[in-house]
Interface confidence: low
C-alpha cells in the first residue's frame, strides 16, 4: 500500500519500510495531521518561552529566527514530547556558548502510541523537518550545511530520514542513543546512517539487546563517529534503588523517567553537559571497552581525541571514515564530564603490603585521591593506573601521595614516592619528585623535579 500527502510526498509499506525480519508487519505512518509535527523555536532572545513557527515566510519573519545563525533542531523519541524539559535544557546550555536558532520538534501526536507504529511515524517527522530545511533554503537562501539535527531514540532515525530526504546536505546529525527495535540491522534507507548528513555523530548508552536486557538503544555503529560512554550498555548511576531513582535531584517526573529508561535517557544528559564542558568528554579510539578499561588506549593519538557530544565536530578526522569507535567514562550524575589522567608512581622506602593513592593539584583545580596500586609495595618498583577525575586540574603544579598498610605493623615502616609522572589525555607529562618517606596515612607532597 501507499499513501501520499501534498507537501511531503508518498509513503509506502513496501520493503524495507515493512515486511522485513526486523519489521514484519506492513504498517503505514499516520497522516501529517495526526502526527502533528510542531516546531518550537527558542533563541538567545527568548530562552525561556518558545515561539511556535512553521515553514512559512511570515511565520519565520515574525519570529526571532535569525538567518545569520546556525539552526539546531532537537527531536524527541518514543512517548516523549517537544515541551519536555530536557529539550529546552539543551537549548539553554547552547545559549551559554553561542547564538543559535534552537528548534524543539514536537511530534507527541505520533510518539504516544505503540512502538511499532511510532517507528513508522518518524518517517513523517523526518519529512516535516526536511520540508522545513528546504523551505529555509528556498525562501531565505539558508544553507542546509548550517543545520544540525539532534535526535534522541526514535528521533535519531527521524533525523536520519530528514537527512536522507535532503540528500545528505544537512551539516550535521547527532544521534542520541538511536532506537534499536525495528532499526538495528535494517538497510541504511530505514535508519540513521553516515550518508544522512555531512557529519553524523552518535552516542550509545543503552546498547544491551532488547532481549533479555530491555536495552532500547542500538549497539550497531551508524555514524562517522560512534561514542560508547562507559561501554555503551550500563551507565553509572542507573542502578540505584527504586525510591532514590524516582525521588531524583531533577524532580519526581524526571526520576520516574529515569527509573523506566535510565540508560536510554543518559545520552541526552551527556550531550547537555558536553555543551558547557568543551574538553570533558574525550573519546579514546580503542578496540573495545574492555581494552579501554585495561588502560591500553591512553593517551590520545597524535590526531587527538574527539569530544563526545556538542564539540564532536571539532575533531579533525571526523569524516575520515565511517563507524569510528570511541570509548570514555563519565560520572554517575550531572556534571557527567570527566578528565582522564595516567599516573605512574616509583616507590621508595620499605617493602610492605598495602595500597597507594595520589591526588592532583593544578592551576584549574584539585582532584580527589585516586588509588594507583594495591599489593606489594617494593622500593624502586613503578606502578601505573588511569583514572577519571571529576575536576580538570589544568597544568599540574603539585601531587600528594598517601599509602595505607594492609596489616597492623608495630615497626611503623616508611614508604615514599621518589617520582610521580602524571600524563594528561593529550600526552602532556608532568614530573614530580621527593626524597622523603612517610608513615602510613601521612600525606607526602611532591613538587616538580
Amino acid at each position: 500500500k501507499e499513501v501520499c500527502y501534498e507537501r511531503l510526498g508518498c509513503f509506502s509499506d513496501d520493503s524495507p519500510w515493512s515486511g522485513i525480519t526486523e519489521r514484519p508487519l506492513h504498517i503505514l505512518p499516520w497522516s501529517p495531521k495526526d502526527v502533528n509535527t510542531r516546531f518550537l523555536l527558542y533563541t538567545n532572545e527568548n530562552p525561556n518561552n518558545f515561539q511556535e513557527v512553521a515553514a512559512d515566510s511570515s511565520s519565520i519573519s515574525g519570529s526571532n529566527f535569525k538567518t545569520n545563525r546556525k539552526t539546531r533542531f532537537i527531536i524527541h523519541g518514543f512517548i516523549d514530547k517537544g515541551e519536555e524539559n530536557w529539550l529546552a535544557n539543551v537549548c539553554k546550555n547552547l545559549f551559554k556558548v553561542e547564538s543559535v536558532n534552537c528548534i524543539c520538534v514536537d511530534w507527541k501526536g505520533g510518539s504516544r502510541t505503540g512502538y511499532t507504529q511510532a517507528s513508522q511515524n518518524i518517517r513523517i517527522v523526518g519529512a516535516e523537518v526536511a520540508y522545513f530545511v528546504e523551505f529555509l533554503q528556498s525562501a531565505f537562501g539558508y544553507s542546509p550545511s548550517n543545520v544540525h539535527v539532534i535526535g534522541h531514540s526514535l528521533g535519531a532515525h527521524a533525523a536520519g530520514e530528514a537527512g536522507r530526504r535532503t540528500n545528505g546536505t544537512i551539516g550535521r546529525i547527532t544521534g542520541l542513543d538511536p532506537a534499536e527495535p525495528c532499526f538495528q540491522g535494517t538497510p541504511e534507507l530505514v535508519r540513521l546512517d553516515p550518508s544522512d548528513a555531512k557529519f553524523v555523530d552518535v552516542i550509545h548508552t543503552d546498547g544491551a539487546p532488547i532481549v533479555p536486557n530491555l536495552g532500547f538503544g542500538m549497539s550497531q555503529v551508524v555514524g562517522h563517529l560512534d561514542f560508547f560512554p562507559n561501554g555503551g550498555v550500563e551507565m553509572p548511576g542507573c542502578k540505584k534503588n527504586i525510591l532514590s531513582q524516582i525521588v531524583d535531584i531533577d524532580g519526581i517526573w524526571e526520576g520516574t523517567r529515569d527509573f523506566a529508561a535510565c540508560n536510554h535517557l543518559r545520552s541526552y544528559k551527556y550531550y547537555t553537559d558536553s555543551i558547557v564542558n568543551p574538553d570533558g568528554f574525550a573519546g579514546f579510539p580503542c578496540a573495545s571497552y574492555n581494552v579501554f578499561t585495561a588502560n591500553k588506549c591512553f593517551p590520545c593519538p597524535s590526531g587527538g581525541c574527539p569530544q563526545m557530544g556538542h564539540y564532536a565536530d571539532r575533531y579533525p578526522g571526523k569524516t575520515n571514515d565511517v563507524g569510528q569507535k570511541f570509548y570514555l567514562d563519565t560520572g554517575d550524575a550531572s556534571n557527567f564530564a570527566r578528565w582522564r589522567y595516567k599516573v605512574s608512581v616509583t616507590l621508595s622506602g620499605k617493602k610492605v603490603t598495602g595500597h597507594i593513592l595520589v591526588s592532583l593539584f593544578g592551576n584549574k583545580g584539585n582532584s580527589k585521591q585516586y588509588e594507583i596500586f594495591k599489593g606489594t609495595l617494593k622500593p624502586d618498583s613503578t606502578h601505573s593506573n588511569e583514572f577519571d577525575s571529576d575536576v580538570d586540574v589544568g597544568d599540574l603544579q603539585m601531587v600528594k601521595f598517601i599509602w595505607y598498610n594492609n596489616v597492623i605493623n608495630p615497626t611503623l615502616p616508611r614508604v615514599g614516592a621518589s617520582k610521580i609522572i602524571v600524563e594528561t589525555n593529550v600526552g602532556k607529562q608532568f614530573n614530580f619528585c621527593s626524597p622523603e618517606t612517610v608513615r602510613e596515612e601521612v600525606l607526602l607532597t611532591l613538587t616538580p623535579c
Epitope: 526486523e22 514484519p24 511499532t116 520516574t256 523517567r257
Partner: nanobody, 120 residues
C-alpha cells in the same frame, strides 16, 4: 485491577511441545512490551522471549528456532509455543507485561507462574 494469568505448563518428554498462554486484563494488554521469563531452581530469572505491541519479536539465544511468541489482540492473550523441548528448559515460566518505556504509568506486571518440566 491489573492481572496476568499464565497457564499451559505441565510435564512433557524431551523433544515434545507445549503451548503457554497468558491472559491479560485489557488495560495491561495494551502494554508496549510483553514477554515470557523463566526461573529454574537455584537460578536467576531470565528472559526467554518478548513481543512488542506491533508484533516485533525477539528471543534469547538458547530458545531461538524452537520457541515462538505471539499475541492475539482480540483475545487479550499472549502465547509461547515451545517445540523440541530439552531438559534444560525445565523451569517456572512467568508472563510479563511492561508499560511503554517512559510512560507516566509505567510498570512491570507478572503472572503467577506455570511449571514446565521436561523429562529425559
Amino acid at each position: 485491577q491489573v492481572q496476568l494469568q499464565d497457564s499451559g505448563g505441565g510435564l512433557v518428554q524431551a523433544g515434545g511441545s507445549l503451548r503457554l498462554s497468558c491472559a491479560a486484563s485489557g488495560s495491561i494488554f495494551s502494554s508496549d512490551l510483553m514477554g515470557w521469563y523463566r526461573q529454574a531452581p537455584g537460578k536467576e530469572r531470565e528472559a526467554v522471549a518478548r513481543i512488542t505491541r506491533g508484533g516485533t519479536t525477539s528471543y534469547a539465544d538458547s530458545v531461538k528456532g524452537r520457541f515462538t511468541i505471539s499475541r492475539d489482540n482480540a483475545k487479550n492473550t499472549m502465547y509461547l509455543q515451545m517445540n523440541s523441548l530439552k531438559p534444560e528448559d525445565t523451569a517456572v515460566y512467568y508472563c510479563n507485561a511492561r508499560r511503554s518505556n517512559y510512560d507516566r504509568s509505567w510498570g512491570d506486571y507478572w503472572g503467577q507462574g506455570t511449571q514446565v518440566t521436561v523429562s529425559s
